[in-house]
Interface confidence: low
Amino acid sequence: SLGSLAAAEPAVIAECKTRTEVFQISRNLIDRTNANFLVWPPCVEVQRCSGCCNNRNVQCRASQVQMRPVQVRKIEIVRKKPVFKKATVTLEDHLACKCETVVTPRPVT
Amino acid sequence: SLGSLAAAEPAVIAECKTRTEVFQISRNLIDRTNANFLVWPPCVEVQRCSGCCNNRNVQCRASQVQMRPVQVRKIEIVRKKPVFKKATVTLEDHLACKCETVVTPRPVT
């Protein structure tokens, strides 16, 4: 709204950089063949690139990534009782970001 | 724990708390009647609740919010030349979070 500019501070651009995000650990990352289990923890923190660049043709992208294996609990229900196993999920952390030109494919004429 | 799955460390739950997120300032927040302008900055940081709670019937929600007006530039194109105006956008920051029971409406029978 254009109205009162009284207490409004200048908006500061959210620069292109890594920020902490929440990653949901979906069950099919662990076992695609079986739905009869739970995963603990259900979500973890990851580092991801986000923010804006100076113009629309440029996007904030990861310039350096690192794969990080973490151990989760796979809680299977066997004969109505929980059975606990360990599983590894590989998370992707972004270590560095850059504003990268987005190449939009030209329409074929 | 550590050795059992090579270098995999135990996954740590992303707790329900405020984290910095990027909010895209869409043009219709400023002027729904006109599309012939740009906004600067195109995005800003906000504080938002995210993370997981202990079970599926509970969700991470904001328990305290604060509205924060910020001043943006509305760059109109008038006769092919940029004209700079100021506008206010009100952002919502989450100040505190809690794990809140999700009441799923019962199907009407």
Partner: antibody, heavy 120, light 107 residues
């Protein structure tokens, strides 16, 4: 390489106090629950205390509750056990161990132990 | 509290023998059961976690089985370096408890 090194053991009189330390290296200490386990001479293993990764949660068996306090300093990669009101039956080798992502895990890294002798 | 009872408390065996140690929990602990090996003057070493999962670096002659209240540690062919004391431990609930140990001696 993961290493846990205990220190601070020694001879102490009944009713006395002692502070044990465990220096950790080779892993992200702040991500792990840590545990103290003790072993009296010629006896089996006994769980003594556990502390969460951030240090906010602690667990003890009744045998040491209100006498022993586990703490940690993640900035120093160190685990501690404060032993108060010591009794002869507290004489044991005290081991620190890494407990994984929660208390309900296995202990797959152990220190070499430090001997506490309670005697007059 | 959950009591862990190991049997036998000691056994004598020869190199090449198949050795079985049992551990019984006073109530169901699902598969929250770990096995450790300890040699004199040394810290315990994790062999098996979650009842049947072999810890990395542990020889495949060691295996674990069981669920609920009854668990078994088996050494398929005893080697000279396996003479030690073995402990089971439940991590199902606090207080965390260990079995009394089984000493495996040379016959």
């Amino acid at each position: 390489e993961v290493q846990l090194v205990e220190s601070g053991g020694g001879l102490v009189q009944p009713g006395g106090s002692l502070r044990l330390s465990c220096a950790a290296s080779g892993f992200t200490f702040s991500s792990f629950w840590m545990t103290w386990v003790r072993q009296a001479p010629g006896k089996g293993l006994e769980w003594v205390a556990s502390i969460s990764a951030g240090g906010g949660i602690t667990h003890y068996p009744d045998s040491v509750k209100d006498r022993f306090t586990v703490s940690r300093d993640n900035a120093k990669n160190s685990l501690y056990l404060q032993l108060n009101s010591l009794r002869a039956e507290d004489t044991a080798v005290y081991y620190c161990a890494e407990s994984g992502g929660d208390i309900y895990s296995d202990f797959d890294y152990w220190g070499q132990g430090t001997l506490v002798t309670v005697s007059s | 509290d959950i009591q862990m009872t190991q049997s036998p408390s000691s056994l004598s065996a020869s190199v090449g023998d198949r050795v079985t140690i049992t551990c019984r929990a006073s109530q169901s602990i699902s598969n929250y059961l770990n096995w450790y090996q300890q040699k004199p003057g040394k810290a315990p070493k994790l062999l098996i976690y979650a009842a049947s999962s072999l810890q990395s670096g542990v020889p495949s002659r060691f295996s674990g089985s069981g669920s609920g209240t009854d668990f078994t540690l088996t050494i398929s062919s005893l080697q000279p370096e396996d003479f030690a004391t073995y402990y089971c431990q439940q991590s199902y609930s606090t207080p965390l408890t260990f079995g009394g140990g089984t000493k495996v001696e040379i016959k």
